[in-house]
């Protein structure tokens, strides 16, 4: 299962950690996709490491763990964020976070 804070807030110009926690006794995480609405933020692959989409490369830092640190937030970053955990043999699990960026 995926456990996450469904709603988080942060100040404009600040940073926030996007984190989904996956728990399973048997399944191994093979890939994690992070998206802002339908736009790719980053992908973690157990075989390749991290790939951060070029449009976010100056503001998105991998970690902690399989989460993301989103920096230099703007009001336009307000919205839905999705984590997708690809696991073997467990299948695919999805989590949703709503980020509200507040004026500083």
């Amino acid at each position: 299962t995926i456990d996450t804070k469904r709603n988080i807030s942060a100040e404009e110009g600040g940073s926030v950690i996007l984190q989904c926690h996956f728990s399973s006794d048997t399944a191994e995480v093979t890939q994690v996709d992070w998206k802002q609405q339908d736009q790719l933020l980053a992908i973690y692959s157990v075989d390749l490491g991290w790939h951060v989409a070029s449009v976010f490369s100056d503001r998105v830092v991998p970690g902690p763990s399989l989460g993301l640190t989103f920096q230099s937030l703007t009001m336009n970053d307000t919205g839905e964020y999705f984590c997708t955990y690809h696991t073997y043999p467990g299948g695919i699990y999805k989590g949703r976070i709503f980020l509200k960026v507040q004026e500083s």
């Epitope: 692959s45 075989d47 390749l48 490491g49 991290w50 790939h51 991998p62």
Partner: antibody, heavy 119, light 107 residues
Framework: QVQLVESGGGVVQPGRSLRLSCAAS????????MHWVRQAPGKGLEWVAV????????YYADSVEGRFTISRDNSKNTLYLQMNSLRAEDTALYYC????????????WGQGTMVTVSS | DIQLTQSPSSVSASVGDRVTITCRAS??????LAWYQQKPGKAPKLLIY???SLQSGVPSRFSGSGSGTDFTLTISSLQPEDFATYYC?????????FGGGTKVEIK
């Protein structure tokens, strides 16, 4: 034994295209990520591209993005690198390589195939 | 992209010497660093992965250490067959990148 054999290199003019092949044997090709790495004459190693086991998850170095395409045919145990709009700076020995699963090191390499871009 | 800086770029040593090569990453890469040996006219050979794990079949005189941004490859007692060029490679971020290489030459 595990083996990778590249082919398809040669001399080509700038702006032209070339397709490299890498024939794999001795391991389960269809379950392995595969990489291309190149080495310009007298220079160091440069990672070029990678492709997922099922042909998805393709990634490229910035220097070749939009010009090179990595692909594979698992029924033929063969990896490909389609190189378009070739430049002089693409001149190099091109290696295909297999990674250690989950360890992100390249443990099996081919002998390389030489690509020379020159007018 | 992550830049890897190797030092020294070349080193002259004798058989039996202890040789240390360093690799510094421009950003933290956890322990996702590999080391390769390459001899003239040959393909690279994987020595170390995960910063410190010895690849199967590699002599125990080779060892790796480090995490974050600073890494070391050590050859405890240099053998004649060890004269070659050594490369580090990071695999924390795509694109994977290699260091510029360190040539180990006979003194």
């Amino acid at each position: 034994q595990v083996q990778l054999v590249e082919s398809g290199g040669g001399v080509v003019q700038p702006g032209r295209s070339l397709r490299l092949s890498c024939a794999a044997s001795g391991f389960t090709f269809s379950s392995s990520y595969m990489h291309w790495v190149r080495q310009a004459p007298g220079k160091g190693l440069e990672w070029v591209a990678v492709i997922g086991a099922d042909g998805s998850n393709k990634y490229y170095a910035d220097s070749v993005e939009g010009r090179f395409t990595i692909s594979r045919d698992n029924s033929k145990n063969t990896l490909y690198l389609q190189m378009n709009s070739l430049r002089a700076e693409d001149t190099a020995l091109y290696y295909c390589a297999k990674p250690v699963p989950r360890r992100r090191g390249l443990d099996v390499w081919g002998q390389g195939t030489m690509v020379t871009v020159s007018s | 992209d992550i830049q890897l800086t190797q030092s020294p770029s070349s080193v002259s040593a004798s058989v039996g010497d202890r040789v240390t090569i360093t690799c510094r990453a421009s950003q933290g890469i956890s322990s996702w660093l590999a080391w390769y040996q390459q001899k003239p006219g040959k393909a690279p050979k994987l020595l170390i992965y995960g910063a410190s794990s010895l690849q199967s079949g590699v002599p125990s005189r080779f060892s790796g250490s480090g995490s974050g941004t600073d890494f070391t490859l050590t050859i405890s007692s240099l053998q004649p067959e060890d004269f070659a060029t050594y490369y580090c490679q990071q695999a924390f971020y795509l694109p994977w990148t290699f260091g510029g290489g360190t040539k180990v030459e006979i003194k």
